[in-house]
């Protein structure tokens, strides 16, 4: 354990092993679980983060109505298959050969099947609606202050280009953040809205993925913004394919 290794850390992903074995002794970090090299100047993909997590020891009117095709991640954690770029593979299977198709944020978008199930392409999640309820405060937050602070948060903590934060809605105590990013809009180097939403979700739950000891301390004009409930809806460029049985259950 050398001094050089001590100086080697990944600010954007604490679930990494880092060593100075990059070019010129540069710090190089690899994600736990997959061993894939990660770029510590930006967010790590959700797929690699989920894989790392599974490998770790177990321990009204202005508000948007989610569309009928919106998905909620009800399946919880699983150990995903990631492609060489760290994205979710379109088809995911568990150890018992049960398979299903996922979207670009890793949320199931078909019924579960067997190994014969085909998932022709990874369907992009182009619209994410983050629905928050904040804890009671003395008064409502000023909407424009709240809007500015949340946009700044996504820009400066999650490195998400401001154009992808489509809107911030507020009707006390509900806050909704809309992220939109079509395939054609996303340029090389742009943070994916799915990754930004995942980092935000983990921050809000007090499970920060960033290296620092502290978590996210979110304040609006000095007033702490504490979230007591989070729901995230995912809308895909192609609607999901579930059987009627699931839809009526």
């Amino acid at each position: 354990h050398t001094a050089a290794q001590d100086n080697c850390t990944c600010p954007t992903n604490k679930m990494t092993v880092c060593s100075p074995d990059g070019p010129g002794g540069r710090c190089q970090c690899r994600a736990l679980g997959s061993g894939m090299a990660v770029d510590c100047s930006t967010l790590t993909s959700k797929c690699l983060l989920l894989k790392a997590r599974m490998s770790a020891p177990k321990n009204a009117r202005t508000l948007v109505r989610p569309s009928e095709h919106a998905l909620v991640d009800n399946d919880g954690l699983y150990d995903p298959d990631c492609d060489p770029e760290g994205r979710f593979k379109a088809r995911q299977c568990n150890q018992t050969s049960v398979c299903w198709c996922v979207n670009s944020v890793g949320v199931r978008r078909t019924d579960k099947g067997d190994l014969s199930l085909r998932c022709d392409e990874l369907v992009r999640t182009h619209h994410i609606l983050i629905d928050l309820r904040h804890r009671p405060t003395a008064g409502a937050f000023n909407h424009s202050d709240l809007d500015a602070e949340l946009r700044r948060l996504f820009r400066e903590r999650y490195r998400l280009h401001p154009k992808f934060v489509a809107a911030v809605h507020y009707e006390q105590p509900t806050i909704q953040i809309e992220l939109r990013q079509n395939t054609s809009q996303k340029a090389a180097g742009d943070v994916d809205i799915g990754d930004a939403a995942y980092y935000f979700e983990r921050d809000i739950k007090g499970e920060s993925l960033f290296q620092g000891r502290g978590g996210l301390d979110l304040r609006v004009r000095g007033e702490p913004l504490q979230v007591e409930r989070t729901l995230i809806y995912y809308l895909d460029e192609i609607p999901p394919k579930f059987s009627m049985k699931r839809l009526t259950a």
């Epitope: 080697c8 850390t9 990944c10 600010p11 510590c40 700044r152 903590r157 000891r213 502290g214």
Partner: nanobody
Framework: QVQLLESGGGLVQPGGSLRLSCAAS????????IGWFRQAPGKEREGVSC????????YYADSVKGRFTISRDNSKNTVYLQMNSLRAEDTAVYYC?????????????????????WGKGTLVTVSS
């Protein structure tokens, strides 16, 4: 083990200059934003200046704009605060700090509650 060590403080006359240094170790320096904060006797700690990680954006409190300049030398793992035209009200203990997220969120706001790691401080006294 993250460590931040400030130096360069001292006694200076009004209108004089000082250059503070913040030497960092224990982390990949060039990935992190570094900020300077100060605390005068009997007052709350306040943000003075901050410099971002990748693109080198700089942020200053209104009270020091045009007088103080922040810079960083990634090859030396050091951030500097050049303080010119010093005034009596600049007297304080100056601390450097870094946020563990590596981003600019807490840096641009010059807010101390977002900073994870702190140095022990260096005293700057401006007096005739």
């Amino acid at each position: 083990q993250v460590q931040l060590l400030e130096s360069g403080g001292g006694l200076v006359q009004p209108g004089g200059s000082l250059r503070l240094s913040c030497a960092a170790s224990g982390f990949t320096f060039d990935y992190y934003a570094i900020g300077w904060f100060r605390q005068a006797p009997g007052k709350e700690r306040e943000g003075v200046s901050c410099i971002s990680s990748s693109h080198g954006s700089t942020y200053y409190a209104d009270s020091v704009k045009g007088r103080f300049t922040i810079s960083r030398d990634n090859s030396k793992n050091t951030v500097y605060l050049q303080m010119n035209s010093l005034r009596a009200e600049d007297t304080a203990v100056y601390y450097c700090a870094t946020a563990g997220d590596g981003g600019d969120y807490h840096c641009s706001g010059l807010v101390d509650y977002g900073m994870d790691y702190w140095g022990k401080g260096t005293l700057v006294t401006v007096s005739s």
